[in-house]
């Protein structure tokens, strides 16, 4: 038999890691293997998440908490709780429907994920380009042209329009 101390709803006495088993006189049965309950008073245990394929286990499931997944090397997490894994690209690239593509001139991506972003337009802040941008790095803005010695000049190319089809999948 099972002793509890609650005089109200017997299920309220069931702690995390157990469920209130209506088929067995509402005793607090331990969650079966590969299932969990993270709060008390639950009438079922939830099935543990399984990190398979491109997912790998970051934290094992237990009777009171679900497993947590991350992504295998070459992929990164997307969505709440790493609900999806997306392919990494190299720095200087972005993921398109056709795979990883180099950033267009005037744009950069300094990460293995995300989209290519336009170089900073230094002239909008009244500054000049100190270091040119690359596919992997943004431009580095320097002092404004007025601060430069006479005869010095700096040209900042306009940021090109984004090409269609360059959003991540």
């Amino acid at each position: 038999f099972e002793r509890t101390r609650s005089l109200q709803d017997p299920c309220s006495n069931c702690p995390a890691g157990t469920f209130c088993d209506n088929n067995r006189n509402q005793i607090c049965s331990p969650c079966p293997p590969n299932s969990f309950s993270s709060a008390g008073g639950q009438r079922t245990c939830d099935i543990c998440r399984q990190c398979k394929g491109v997912f790998r286990t970051r934290k094992e499931c237990s009777s009171t908490s679900n497993a947590e997944c991350d992504c295998t090397p070459g992929f990164h997490c997307l969505g709440a709780g790493c609900s999806m894994c997306e392919q990494d690209c190299k720095q200087g690239q972005e993921l398109t429907k056709k795979g990883c593509k180099d950033c267009c001139f005037g744009t950069f991506n300094d990460q293995k994920r995300g989209i290519c972003r336009p170089w900073t337009n230094c002239s909008l802040d009244g500054k000049s380009v100190l270091v040119n941008g690359t596919k992997e790095r943004d431009v580095v803005c320097g002092p404004s042209p007025a601060d430069l010695s006479p005869g010095a000049s700096s040209v900042t190319p306009p940021a090109p329009a984004r090409e269609p089809g360059h959003s991540p999948q």
């Epitope: 099972e2 002793r3 995390a16 890691g17 157990t18 331990p30 293997p33």
Partner: antibody
Framework: EVQLVESGGGLVQPGGSLRLSCAAS?????????PCWVRQAPGKCLEWIGC?????????YDANWTKGRFTISRDNSKNTVYLQMNSLRAEDTAVYYC?????????????WGQGTLVTVSS | DIQMTQSPSSLSASVGDRVTITCQAS??????LAWYQQKPGKAPKLLIY???TLASGVPSRFSGSGSGTDFTLTISSLQPEDFATYYC???????????FGCGTKVTV
């Protein structure tokens, strides 16, 4: 080292009481690890006595034959579980084992103590 | 209450033999069954849990099967260290749910 160590066994007269202890080391009882008691009379089968929820709740699971004579309790601060045995009879003579019932092992007993002998005799 | 019935209660076998032990539950326990090995004067050792999952460090010659009420422990090729008593246990908690079978003694 991960282990369970029982103590408190010995000779007791019929009708008497005894409290066995089981100290856990190398791990903590939790919602994933329930401490249990199992006994084995000389030359006989294993007999399940009961278990207690490993977390902070006092839920116990007991074999019906104990009829309240045996009570399992736990002191989390000492990581120790107890078996209080009252109204002892000659047929309670047995080796008493403490075992860990683990969620990770399908609630099977994946860790056992060495056992402590209880002899009920006048 | 759940009762566990093991058979046979004892058996004689030789090294290299295939040995099969059965366990029957008085009501369905799904796959919530464990098998143990016990040698004289020692505590039981977990062999198999969840009816068919081998416990850590247990040789692959041991295997378990079954679900519901009927379960089997098989030793594919008996080794000298396997002579012992084997117990099944329901791990279906509550209502006397964790009962043991009464063992099968495997002797030479």
């Amino acid at each position: 080292e991960v282990q369970l160590v029982e103590s408190g066994g010995g000779l007791v007269q019929p009708g008497g009481s005894l409290r066995l202890s089981c100290a856990a080391s190398g791990f903590s009882f939790s919602a994933n690890y329930y401490p249990c008691w199992v006994r084995q009379a000389p030359g006989k089968c294993l007999e399940w006595i009961g278990c207690i929820y490993g977390g902070s709740s006092d839920i116990t699971y007991d074999a019906n034959w104990t009829k309240g004579r045996f009570t399992i309790s736990r002191d989390n601060s000492k990581n120790t579980v107890y078996l209080q045995m009252n109204s002892l009879r000659a047929e309670d003579t047995a080796v008493y084992y403490c075992a860990r019932s683990a969620w990770y092992s399908g609630w099977g007993g994946d860790l056992w103590g060495q056992g402590t002998l209880v002899t009920v005799s006048s | 209450d759940i009762q566990m019935t093991q058979s046979p209660s004892s058996l004689s076998a030789s090294v290299g033999d295939r040995v099969t032990i059965t366990c029957q539950a008085s009501q369905s326990i799904s796959n919530r069954l464990a098998w143990y090995q016990q040698k004289p004067g020692k505590a039981p050792k977990l062999l198999i849990y969840s009816a068919s999952t081998l416990a850590s460090g247990v040789p692959s010659r041991f295997s378990g099967s079954g679900s519901g009420t009927d379960f089997t422990l098989t030793i594919s090729s008996l080794q000298p260290e396997d002579f012992a008593t084997y117990y099944c246990q329901s791990t279906y908690y509550g209502n006397d749910g964790n009962a043991f079978g009464c063992g099968t003694k495997v002797t030479v």
